[in-house]
């Protein structure tokens, strides 16, 4: 049977993002639509046709265009997205003979890790805060010369969609750990990033 | 030059079936979707279905009830219109045609089909 | 399903004549709508479609107007060869549905 072809997409915020749909089907569409699915009913978006050219909602006048202009192929592009954008998008191309044959592509926005590494010294003790902020939630480990050292780690998830996460390394013997590296790994979006700190005494 | 060409007239008794076959030349078969419709005596021009031939993707009038089946042989650049279960009122000039989209341009010269007892 | 008028059923012109038939829409149809030529014995030919374009080789006397559910076809100079049946098809909905026919005869 005649089908669409997708591919989700997953891109940085504040970037462009570029969503296609692909018609398998040896005759053109009549019309292409793009759609928002939203909970209650699907939003449109924007139309393509050869009657009518580009017809933009006013919604998402300043925010897509349609990039590849097909009625066969279509592409249509975020040039700044947000946190808003995020969900999944329906093409529907309205066919002779065959009505309308629909496709779904979603997009993921992603926000890279900022990472911040530091330590502290108390009388008897140190504490090696590792914290990365992102989207989505990352992932902190610890990469310790010896085994037994403690951590504690700490969720907190953000207004603006991204999540803080902080672990902290409690060393109870500190004379041991100076000149000594400690690392803190982060895994984000399947990537593993080291952050090395190495223990001086203040 | 582009040519659909279908298969000579046909009686048939009520209750029996009748498959009608176009031969296309001059073009790629698979790029054109395959159009049915039937005029009976007097009558306006009814769609009876079509099929992509492509993809062998078919679609038809309901009203017909499950009793027509739109095939293809791409090997033979033909496309088929069977309608089974048939009665007087199937008596009709059966029509194939092509198109692109909504561009229909070339159409078979007809098959008349006559249902009697 | 949707069903497609044409007003009027018949008509008679003499060469020259300006000729309108109308095809009205039981419901919306955007501009999905084509028309045929039919002459006795003889396939339908596609005169226009999308409402208001013309197929390659009609002459340029046949013209199609309207959107929504109101169409018209003009021929602006009519010729003795215009004679025959005139039906609207539309295609915005399956099954896709014919006029009743427009029978154009030459005086």
């Known amino acids: 049977q005649v089908q669409v072809v997708t591919q989700d997409e997953r891109e940085q915020l504040y970037t462009p993002a570029s969503l296609k749909c692909s018609l398998q089907n040896a005759q053109e569409a009549l019309i292409v639509t793009w759609q928002k699915k939203k909970a209650v009913s699907p939003e449109n978006m924007v139309t393509f046709s050869e009657n009518h050219g580009v017809v933009i909602q006013p919604a998402y006048k300043d925010k897509i265009n349609i990039t590849q202009l097909g009625l066969q192929n279509s592409t249509i592009t975020f040039w700044n997205i947000t946190l808003e954008d995020e969900g999944c998008y329906m093409c529907l191309f309205n066919t002779f003979g065959f009505g309308k044959i629909s496709g779904t592509a979603c997009l993921t926005v992603y926000v890279q890790p900022i990472v911040s590494l530091h330590y502290k010294f108390s009388e008897d003790h140190l504490n090696i805060t590792c914290s990365a902020t992102a989207r989505p939630a990352p992932m902190v480990f610890w990469k310790v010369p010896r085994s037994g050292i403690e951590n504690s780690t700490v969720t907190l998830s953000h207004p603006n969609g991204t999540t803080s996460v902080t672990s902290i390394l409690h060393i109870k013997d500190p004379k041991n750990q100076v000149g000594k590296e400690v690392i803190c790994q982060v895994l984000h979006l399947g990537t593993v990033t080291d952050f090395k700190q190495t223990v001086n005494k203040g | 030059q582009v040519q659909l060409v279908q298969s000579g007239a046909e009686v048939k008794k009520p209750g029996a079936s009748v498959k009608v076959s176009c031969k296309a030349s001059?073009?790629?078969?698979?790029?054109?979707?395959i159009l049915w419709v039937r005029q009976a005596p007097g009558q306006r021009l009814e769609w009876m279905g079509h099929?992509?031939?492509?993809?062998?993707?078919?679609n038809y009038n309901l009203k017909f009830k499950g009793r027509v089946t739109i095939t293809r042989d791409t090997s033979a650049s033909t496309a088929y219109m069977e309608l089974s279960s048939l009665r007087s009122e199937d008596t009709a000039v059966y029509y194939c045609?092509?198109?692109?989209?909504?561009?229909?341009?070339?159409w078979g010269q007809g098959t008349l089909v006559t249902v009697s007892s | 399903d949707i069903q497609m008028t044409q007003s009027p059923s018949s008509l008679s012109a003499s060469v020259g004549d300006r000729v309108t038939i109308t095809c009205k829409a039981s419901?919306?149809?955007?501009?999905?709508l084509s028309w045929f030529q039919q002459k006795p014995g003889k396939a339908p030919k596609s005169l226009i479609y999308?409402?208001?374009r013309l197929v390659d080789g009609v002459p340029s006397r046949f013209s199609g107007s309207g959107s929504g559910t109101d169409f018209t076809l003009t021929i602006s100079s009519l010729q003795p060869e215009d004679f025959g049946t005139y039906y609207c098809?539309?295609?915005?909905?399956?099954?896709?549905?014919f006029g009743q026919g427009t029978k154009l005869e030459i005086k």
């Open positions: 045609g092509r198109s692109k989209r909504d561009y229909f341009d070339y």
């Open positions: 001059g073009y790629s078969f698979t790029d054109y979707i």
């Open positions: 099929i992509d031939p492509y993809y062998g993707s078919s």
């Open positions: 419901q919306d149809i955007n501009s999905y």
């Open positions: 999308r409402a208001n």
């Open positions: 098809l539309q295609y915005d909905e399956f099954p896709y549905t």
